[in-house]
């Protein structure tokens, strides 16, 4: 009987092994080994045994020892199992962005590696095992499907092979693919909320706000705001899962008419859009014309208000008759009209909205100077030594200057508290003067002596 030792060997690919062949009789007629592998006899052997070194073992093999003894011929095989770790362990690329709530298929390819029976393929999230499967086929392909949540954003996924030859080989052989980082996103199905004026006046500034809730990761979201061909430059404020983009928009006469306001929120490979119509209009303030802004009292003044051809005007609260863009009225200027405001209010309908513009003009009426008995009494009688305040008010526009002099030299302190003395007695000539002329009025002060009381 022929014996072989060791009967089984597990060795790395390209490795060497020593195999002992022995016969059961003391003096075999022949003793040898049959193998396609390169072999070398290790001398000296024994009477009934030989030692061979097999080298560069590339694949599983079954070298055979044989012996020819007087009692007959026999053979025995040793089982050489070659092991090697895979040459390629690769996780298929992940999608650039993975929507939250949608299943992700992880695919791993394994090229090479033996023995396959001892080769396991694992799919990992970080260091957590998601799936463990045997390597089947060449290349072996392992897949698994996992649900994706927000917490998977930024997670690393990889594929690992384990060649487990224990207890024959004490070591566990691991090969890990390059990790792939997953980018997840959550873009709600609801479109962004767009707050903007429905109508916008040429050369004025409007504010547009576009906001969306339920975004993840919000910092990766991009916002595009445009009014017609005009790209807006928004300031973006981020919340926990929301964003708000605020932009100022100024429109020119060239953009007059209906324009589309577009807000797009891009996240991952998806976009949510909202469109809104904005009507851009031109509406100059109405013109209030006075035949002359400064007139003398008694002059006839035409007050005219003219606005946009499609507007309706009101002049001092009175609508134009018939309703339209023009209104006027005639007045004879009186001192009471000095400083009077003429206000024209124009209303224009733009896209179903009423817009208003006002313009005010003030009329200056030149009159006077005047010195009336009511405001400048001609006679005062005051007790001697009493405290009195001489009052004399001159009226006019421009406001007149006033002086009251007795004998061209003694002034009467108008509006001042005076102690009445004999010196105060007499007739004063009060003069009110403005650029329009001069008026005079005599004012007599009588002083009552205590002895007459």
């Amino acid at each position: 009987q022929t014996s072989v030792f060791p009967p089984e060997v597990i060795l790395p690919r390209g490795g060497s092994v020593k195999v002992n062949c022995s016969a059961s009789c003391d003096q075999p007629i022949s003793l040898g080994m049959e193998t396609p592998l390169p072999k070398k006899e290790i001398l000296p052997g024994g009477n009934n045994w030989k030692m061979y070194e097999l080298s560069n073992v590339q694949e599983d093999s079954q070298p055979m020892c044989y012996s020819n003894c007087p009692d007959g011929q026999s053979s025995a095989k040793t089982l050489l199992t070659v092991y090697w770790t895979p040459e390629r362990v690769e996780l298929a690329p992940l999608p650039p962005w993975q929507p939250v709530g949608k299943n992700l298929t992880l695919r791993c390819q394994v090229e090479g590696g033996a023995p396959r029976a001892n080769l396991t393929v694992m799919l990992l999230r970080g260091e957590k095992e998601l799936s463990r499967q045997s390597a089947v086929g060449e290349p072996a392909e392992v897949t698994t499907t996992v649900p994706v949540g927000r917490d998977d954003h930024g997670a690393n996924f990889s594929c690992r092979t384990e060649l487990d030859l224990r207890p024959y080989v004490l070591k566990l052989f691991e090969n890990t693919s390059a990790p792939h980082q997953l980018q997840t996103f959550d873009l709600p199905a609801t479109p962004p909320q767009l707050v903007s004026p429905q109508v916008l006046e040429v050369d004025t500034q409007g504010t547009v706000v576009c906001s969306l809730d339920g975004l993840f990761p919000v910092s990766e979201a991009q916002v595009s705001l445009a009014l017609g061909d005009q790209k807006l430059n928004p300031t973006i404020t981020y919340g926990n899962n929301s964003l708000s983009a605020k932009a100022s928009v100024k429109v020119t006469a060239e953009e007059e008419g209906t324009q589309q306001l577009l807000c797009g929120v891009m996240l991952g490979n998806q976009t949510q859009e909202t469109r809104q119509t904005v009507t851009i209009y031109s509406f100059p303030a109405p013109n209030v014309n006075l035949t002359k802004p400064e007139v003398s009292e008694g002059t006839e003044v035409i007050v005219e208000c003219e606005a946009h051809p499609r507007a309706k005007v009101m002049l001092n609260g009175v609508p134009a008759q018939p309703p339209g863009p023009r209104a006027q009225f005639l007045l004879k200027a009186t001192p009471e009209d000095n400083g009077r405001s003429f206000s024209c209010s124009a209303t224009l309908e733009v896209a179903g909205q009423l817009v208003h513009k006002n313009q005010t003009r003030e009329l200056r009426v030149l009159y006077g100077p005047r010195l009336d008995e009511k405001d400048c009494p001609g006679n005062w009688t005051w007790p001697e030594n009493s405290q009195q305040t001489p009052m004399c008010q001159a009226w006019g526009n421009p406001l007149p200057q006033l002086k009251c002099l007795k004998d061209g030299t003694f002034p009467l302190p108008i509006g001042q508290s005076v102690t009445v003395t004999r010196d105060l007695e007499g007739t004063y000539l009060c003069q009110a003067r403005s650029t329009r002329g001069e008026v005079t009025r005599e004012v007599t002060v009588n002083v009552l002596s205590p002895r007459y009381e």
């Epitope: 004998d407 061209g408 030299t409 302190p413 010196d423």
Partner: antibody
């Protein structure tokens, strides 16, 4: 509108001297006219005034020694028994409150009176 | 009597400095006060009327204030051309007067 003094010069103590102020461009029936003097190197001294009505008002020290009178275009200042202390430049002045701030500066150029024996 | 007292009699000031001249009336003259500037050999020239109103052509560095019996003339940012004698005059009463003018203040500019 202008005022100008005349009649100044050398006068002997105890004599009589009349200075005349001639006005143009305004009426003396509407304005008061005053006399002010200034001794060499000294301050301004108010003598008196004649009102638009013709009434006269004098500084307490000038009463009895000076007399102001007027015609339709002139105002006279009569100095009775002048002494060397009356040596001064005499100014004729239209009353400051004649006309709302535009006539306050209506002073004559002054006439010098020298009292010396 | 409506008489005027003016202080100081003389003041020296550097170019760019400030001068304050005071004038006191013996009785209430309200705001009927004038300020004059007089240069050697010339007639007086009006600066201020009604206590604080600037006569036409007078630079704004001249400022008058006060009413009743206390009045002030302030010259800020004094210039060499401001060297002169300054007088106040009450213009309220022409009777019962010793002197309607203050004694004058000589301003010497260094």
């Amino acid at each position: 509108q202008s005022v100008e003094e005349s009649g100044g010069g050398l006068v002997k103590p105890g004599g009589t001297l009349t200075l005349t102020c001639t006005v143009s461009g305004f009426s003396l029936s509407s304005y008061a006219m005053g006399w002010v003097r200034q001794a060499p190197g000294k301050g301004l001294e108010y003598i008196g005034i004649i009102g638009s009505s013709g009434s006269t008002y004098y500084a307490s020290w000038a009463k009895g020694r000076f007399t102001i009178s007027k015609t339709s275009t002139t105002v006279d200042l009569k100095i009775t028994s002048p002494t060397t202390e009356d040596t001064a430049t005499y100014f004729c002045v239209r009353d400051p409150y004649d006309s709302f701030g535009d006539g306050y500066r209506l002073w004559g150029p002054g006439t010098l009176v020298t009292v010396s024996s | 009597a409506y008489d005027m007292t003016q202080t100081p009699a003389s003041v020296e000031v550097a170019v760019g400095g400030t001068v304050t001249i005071k004038c006191q009336a013996s009785e209430n003259i309200y705001r009927y006060l004038l300020w004059y500037q007089q240069k050697l050999g010339q007639r007086p020239s009006l600066l201020i009327y009604d206590a604080s109103k600037l006569a036409s052509g007078v630079p704004s560095r001249f400022k008058g204030s006060g009413s009743g019996t206390e009045f002030t003339l302030t010259i800020s940012g004094v210039q060499s051309d401001d060297a002169a004698t300054y007088y106040c005059q009450q213009a309220y009463s022409s009777s019962n007067v010793d002197n309607a003018f203050g004694g004058g203040t000589e301003v010497v500019v260094k």
